[in-house]
């Protein structure tokens, strides 16, 4: 009855502060409307990073000012988070909600630990 959500345990952000990972869910039914939310958990506090609702077969659209982008393919969502700094290192949880048709299902991933290392500033060259 519970919906399983899988995501990688660890991802290392690029030197440009971009991290990508796949969030895959085992849909118990044939959902047509799905909401995907990325949550960040730090010190047992959970905050929303970004969220998008999409119709199956359509593109995943985050708000214009969102730090996330993504694409969907079947029960798989490819998520990219940009603009990350070292202080953003933490556990990023993929939350999937099957909104329509009934019944509603909630799926919570175990989280992806994203490590972000700020690039060293380039030395001045004379």
């Amino acid at each position: 009855k519970a919906m399983h959500v899988a995501q990688p345990a660890v991802v290392l952000a690029s030197s440009r502060g971009i991290a990508s990972f796949v969030c895959e869910y085992a849909s118990p039914g044939k959902a047509t409307e799905v909401r995907v939310t990325v949550l960040r958990q730090a010190d047992s506090q959970v905050t929303e990073v970004c969220a998008a609702t999409y119709m199956m077969g359509n593109e995943l659209t985050f708000l214009d000012d969102s730090i996330c982008t993504g694409t969907s393919s079947g029960n798989q969502v490819n998520l990219t988070i940009q603009g990350l700094r070292a202080m953003d290192t933490g556990l990023y949880i993929c939350k999937v909600e099957l909104m329509y048709p009934p019944p509603y299902y909630l799926g919570i991933g175990n989280g992806t630990q994203i490590y972000v290392i700020d690039p060293e500033p380039c030395p001045d060259s004379d």
């Epitope: 118990p28 409307e33 949550l39 929303e48 019944p103 299902y105």
Partner: antibody
């Protein structure tokens, strides 16, 4: 701080209607799904209805389907429950509740009492 | 619909004792989707435990949750006077959202 304040309860005759409201404050209302839960006198908790972020998706308990309508106004941070064809079995304290990020009902209002009696 | 059955219906204990409350589901509930609430007379329910074993903000560590599949447990290690109340389990993984019928923890 997060606050949910219900209003609109009262005494109503069987077959009549009542409209409950829940005023939300202290959080970004549109970022959360919401529920109504009721509790008959001396009884346990019964989930009544759910509404999605934008109000497009609604789910109801079988006991109220076709009689109750949930809605929300994200511009006014308000959740509403329209109750029609009320019966004595609908007598209860009605709570609005917020769904937390990970799914449980993390904040509840103080409740409003609805009494259906002739 | 997932039916949750709580036992016992009433638990009579003294302050300082350990309380063990059970919640059994009619079908498997992922541990991520099981919560416990506390309700005192005249008050709204308060979230205690979510995800079967994570304590909600501000909940003392004498409250702990465990279990998986169909069997879940709420344990209060040492009862304080303010812990005497009714406790409900809830599943929130799929609609309809369901609650157990409650366990009343009363002073012996």
């Amino acid at each position: 701080q997060v606050q949910l304040v219900e209003s609109g309860g009262g005494v109503v005759q069987p077959g009549r209607s009542l409209r409950l409201s829940c005023a939300a404050s202290g959080f970004t209302f549109s970022s959360y799904t919401m529920h109504w839960v009721r509790q008959a006198p001396g009884k346990g908790l019964e989930w009544v209805t759910f509404i999605s972020y934008d109000g497009n998706n609604k789910y109801y308990a079988d006991s109220v389907k076709g009689r109750f309508t949930i809605s929300r106004d994200n511009s006014k941070n308000t959740l509403t429950l329209e109750m029609n064809s009320l019966t004595e079995e609908d007598t209860a304290i009605y709570y609005c509740a917020r769904t937390g990020w990970l799914g449980p009902f993390d904040y509840w209002g103080q409740g409003t009492l609805v009494t259906v009696s002739s | 619909e997932i039916v949750l059955t709580q036992s016992p219906g009433t638990l009579s204990l003294s302050p300082g004792e350990r309380a063990t409350l059970s919640c059994r589901a009619s079908q498997s509930v992922g541990s991520s989707y099981l919560a416990w609430y506390q309700q005192k007379p005249g008050q709204a329910p308060r979230l205690l435990i979510y995800g079967a074993f994570s304590r909600a903000t501000g909940i003392p560590d004498r409250f702990s949750g465990s279990g998986s599949g169909t069997d879940f447990t709420l344990t209060i290690s040492r009862l304080e006077p303010e812990d005497f109340a009714v406790y409900y389990c809830q599943q929130y993984g799929s609609s309809p959202w369901t609650f157990g019928q409650g366990t009343k923890v009363e002073i012996k």
